[in-house]
């Protein structure tokens, strides 16, 4: 999916009001010095591409974050504010249902969510312009 035509300001507002708080809840008890951000993004569409990948694609050591509250709210925000996003996700959702697993918060998942916070932070930053 190409995130170029999303309403970035509406997604940002949704993140600040709810999604960010769910990420903090997920990370509660983790030291703020524990993880360095290693995943980066260069502009808002790229940030959303990376956010989608880390949120919804299973990785080694962290089978799925897709059923977490922050993930469901992320999916809703993208569906509402990114034209045509919902249609692209139907097949992916059906595949996800087949491989749904018991929720386990591993250290790898915590690290992944820390990376997500970093990606969202880059997405939210003001446009940094060289004068």
């Amino acid at each position: 999916y190409d995130f170029t035509n999303c309403d970035f300001e509406k997604i940002k507002a949704a993140y600040l009001s709810t999604i960010s708080k769910d990420l903090i809840t997920y990370m509660s008890g983790t030291k703020s010095t524990e993880f360095n951000n290693t995943v980066s993004c260069s502009n808002r569409p790229h940030c959303l591409t990376e956010i989608q990948s880390l949120t919804f694609n299973p990785t080694a050591g962290c089978a799925s974050l897709a059923k977490e509250m922050f993930a469901m709210k992320t999916k809703a925000a993208l569906a509402i504010w990114c034209p045509g996003y919902s249609e692209t996700q139907i097949n992916a959702t059906q595949a996800m249902k087949k491989r749904r697993k018991r929720k386990v918060t591993t250290n790898k998942c915590l690290e992944q969510v820390s990376q997500l916070q970093g990606l969202w932070r880059r997405f939210n930053r003001p446009l940094l312009k060289q004068q």
């Epitope: 300001e9 940002k12 507002a13 993140y15 600040l16 009001s17 960010s20 903090i24 703020s32 010095t33 524990e34 993880f35 360095n36 951000n37 916070q117 970093g118 969202w120 932070r121 880059r122 997405f123 939210n124 930053r125 003001p126 446009l127 940094l128 312009k129 004068q131």
Partner: antibody
Framework: QVQLVQSGAEVKKPGASVKVSCKAS????????IEWVRQAPGQGLEWMGI????????YYAQKFQGRVTLTADKSTSTAYMELSSLRSEDSAVYYC????????????WGQGTTLTVSS | DIQMTQSPSSLSASVGDRVTITCRAS??????LVWYQQKPGKAPQLLVY???NLADGVPSRFSGSGSGTQFSLTISSLQPEDFATYYC?????????FGTGTKLEIK
């Protein structure tokens, strides 16, 4: 806990340079931008610029372009603001501040460094 | 550069009063606005981000609203510790200019 500790007060002569430090602790230094703001006596807040400690990328207010240099030392988790060609109107309190977790504000501030420029 | 204009520049009020400070941006900044409180000799403290989200530890008597070019900060019932100077700052693009400030004084 997150802390930003700035260097002590400075007295400089017009034309000289000053370098203010801002030592960060309690968080992953390279993950967050650092902003610099100044406040002249009895005046409002004035935005000077931002540095990304990870990349070293800097963004300056046009007013300070060419006179201010922001740097960051990852090994010591310290940000620096150097201001050159000082004039009396540069007398102010200089603050560093850390970007918030969400990237939508600056949530922790240093205690401020007072600069006096006088002949 | 985006200009931020605050009004009033100063305001006298009493404990228990409801007060509203406004901030106007010279162009559309959507919801990219922050409010800070500053007391004499101290660094600014974050109150509100994203125009309407309260920062951690900020009392619920504070609230932010607005979007586009018009924003406001409301204190529903003034407490003695609320007498200070308040600044808005836009967070849309660099340079991240501040408002001119509003000094809230005891009547």
């Amino acid at each position: 806990q997150v802390q930003l500790v700035q260097s002590g007060a400075e007295v400089k002569k017009p034309g000289a340079s000053v370098k203010v430090s801002c030592k960060a602790s309690g968080y992953a230094f390279t993950n967050y931008l650092i902003e610099w703001v100044r406040q002249a006596p009895g005046q409002g807040l004035e935005w000077m610029g931002i540095i990304n400690p990870e990349s070293g990328d800097t963004y300056y207010a046009q007013k300070f372009q060419g006179r201010v240099t922001l740097t960051a030392d990852k090994s010591t988790s310290t940000a620096y603001m150097e201001l050159s060609s000082l004039r009396s109107e540069d007398s102010a309190v200089y603050y560093c501040a850390k970007e918030s977790l969400t990237g939508s504000s600056y949530d922790y501030w240093g205690q401020g460094t007072t600069l006096t420029v006088s002949s | 550069d985006i200009q931020m204009t605050q009004s009033p520049s100063s305001l006298s009020a009493s404990v228990g009063d409801r007060v509203t400070i406004t901030c106007r941006a010279s162009e559309n900044i959507y919801s990219n606005l922050v409010w800070y409180q500053q007391k004499p000799g101290k660094a600014p403290q974050l109150l509100v981000y994203g125009a309407r989200n309260l920062a951690d530890g900020v009392p619920s008597r504070f609230s932010g609203s607005g979007s586009g070019t018009q924003f406001s900060l409301t204190i529903s019932s003034l407490q003695p510790e609320d007498f200070a100077t308040y600044y808005c700052q836009h967070f849309y693009e660099t340079p991240l200019t501040f408002g001119t400030g509003t000094k809230l004084e005891i009547k």
